[in-house]
């Protein structure tokens, strides 16, 4: 996150980290139900492990820390590497979360954003571009949704209806390593981190999410399909 | 040097138990999945099962009941047994691991096992 | 059942030619795809992954394109060393699945 602040600690109970061994993180996640996550289907990787509850981004012990193995994983089978459409994945948990303070599922939107909403979007990846830098501690920042048309201006011919932009002003966007956390609106969660200019938080090139008011019935019938 | 090499006996009486082992050399069984695939003379690549390094296991269809898969992190070894045997099951098998982006980046040069009284 | 058929099983080429082998998953297997060479006597060769990047060592000369359930591996120009089978596996499920991998295409000299 470019930009953006430390997240107020247990304010963001369904982010999730998911990690490389020993301890890297290589994307975010959001947990959605008490045994499966969202992400990203281009953050897909055969072995990880998934860490909820820990605020800070190096490993060391937090109380309120579970940490799982994601035992499937479900891209969305519209997705198309490296391309940027219909990017979002299901995994399942080894198990069901117990519910804390720090652990706890968010709804995914059925309504689809309107330009102006604001929402607030999470996670630990570089605080620098093109630089790399990573924070100590979850960042969050809040950021707009834009208009479609804006959003195909600034990438012509890139964007489809499973894409929204969002942004705020220059120098505050998502990046690096933040891929497949949440964006929150209105208290439920509209987006994952998806793609965007390189390097980031450059002028008139917003972060693009995945559109997740696009897939709640996806979402449903595989959680239903594989519990 | 990143290597696998798969061992077992050769020859292996119908309705006995195949048992192999692949030994693990060069990486951590902790970093990766690892895979069994076998070979019958002439024929294509067959897809036994899966395991990682949570000891999850995948099994193809055709195999659950009969295969079983398990590793051993403190040997660096990964082992397959089956189960039952025929002469449908001889094969060249080989353990493979997966690069972490779903493909068999390295690979063992495979152990031919004869089914056959 | 995702079932992964080959086509064709094999083709008969000449030095220099360009190539092509296709596979069709029998559902939507996304960018899950890989490809292998396999010699005679050897064990397979990975080539490329995620249906279309390219693995470590591997000459550009092979390529693979193709996303949900069409896929191709094309040889731009065929070497000596590239007459083998070729096999391709699909890396999205592996629930309910009886094999992973096509049948295989055998490219010979003609």
């Known amino acids: 996150i470019i930009n953006g602040s430390d997240c107020d600690m247990h304010t963001q109970p369904w982010q999730a980290a998911l990690l490389l061994r020993p301890n890297q993180l290589y994307c975010g996640a959001v947990l959605v139900h008490p045994q499966w996550l969202l992400t990203a289907a281009h953050c897909r990787k055969k072995v990880f492990r998934v860490r909820l509850g820990h605020y800070s981004l190096s490993p060391v012990y937090e109380s309120g820390q579970q940490m799982f193995q994601g035992v499937k994983s479900i891209p969305h089978p519209g997705y198309s590497h490296p391309g940027h459409s219909n990017d979002l994945m299901l995994i399942k948990l080894n198990r069901r979360i117990r519910p804390t303070k720090d652990v706890r599922p968010i709804n995914v939107s059925s309504h689809c954003p309107s330009a102006g909403t604001k929402c607030l979007v999470s996670g630990w990846g570089t605080t620098k571009s093109p630089q790399v830098h990573f924070p100590k501690v979850l960042q969050c920042l809040n950021i707009s949704v834009l208009s479609q048309k804006r959003c195909e201006d600034a990438y012509p011919r890139q964007i489809d209806d499973t894409m929204f932009c969002a942004g705020d002003k220059a120098g505050r966007d998502s990046c690096q390593g933040d891929s497949g956390g949440p964006v929150v609106c209105n208290g439920s969660l509209q987006g994952l981190v998806s793609w965007g200019d390189y390097p980031c938080a450059r002028p008139n090139r917003p972060g693009v999410y995945t559109n997740l008011c696009k897939f709640t019935k996806w979402i449903q019938e595989t959680i239903q399909a594989n519990s | 040097e990143v290597q696998l090499q798969e061992s077992g006996p050769g020859l292996v009486k119908p309705s006995g138990t195949l048992s192999l082992t692949c030994a693990v050399s060069?990486?951590?069984?902790?970093?990766?999945?690892m895979s069994w695939v076998r070979q019958p003379p002439g024929k294509g690549l067959e897809w036994i099962g899966d395991?990682?390094?949570?000891?999850?296991?995948d099994y193809a269809s055709w195999a659950k009941g009969r295969v079983t898969i398990s590793q051993d992190s403190s040997k660096n070894q990964v082992s397959l047994k089956l189960s039952s045997v025929t002469a449908a099951d001889t094969a060249v098998y080989y353990c493979a691991r997966d690069n972490n982006d779903y493909g068999l980046d390295i690979w063992g040069q495979g152990t031919l096992v004869t089914v056959s009284s | 059942a995702y079932q992964m058929t080959q086509s064709p099983s094999s083709l008969s080429a000449s030095v220099g030619d360009r190539v092509t082998i296709t596979c069709q998953a029998s559902?939507?297997?996304?960018?899950?795809l890989a490809w292998y060479q396999q010699k005679p006597g050897k064990a397979p060769k990975l080539l490329i992954y995620?249906?279309?990047t390219l693995a470590s060592g591997v000459p550009s000369r092979f390529s693979g394109s193709g996303s949900g359930t069409d896929f191709t591996l094309t040889i731009s120009s065929l070497q000596p060393e590239d007459f083998a089978t070729y096999y391709c596996q699909q890396g999205y499920t592996n629930s309910n699945i009886i094999n992973t991998f096509g049948g295989g295409t055998k490219v010979e000299i003609k």
């Open positions: 995620l249906a279309s």
């Open positions: 559902q939507s297997i996304s960018s899950w």
């Open positions: 395991i990682y390094p949570s000891d999850i296991i």
């Open positions: 060069g990486f951590p069984l902790s970093n990766y999945a």
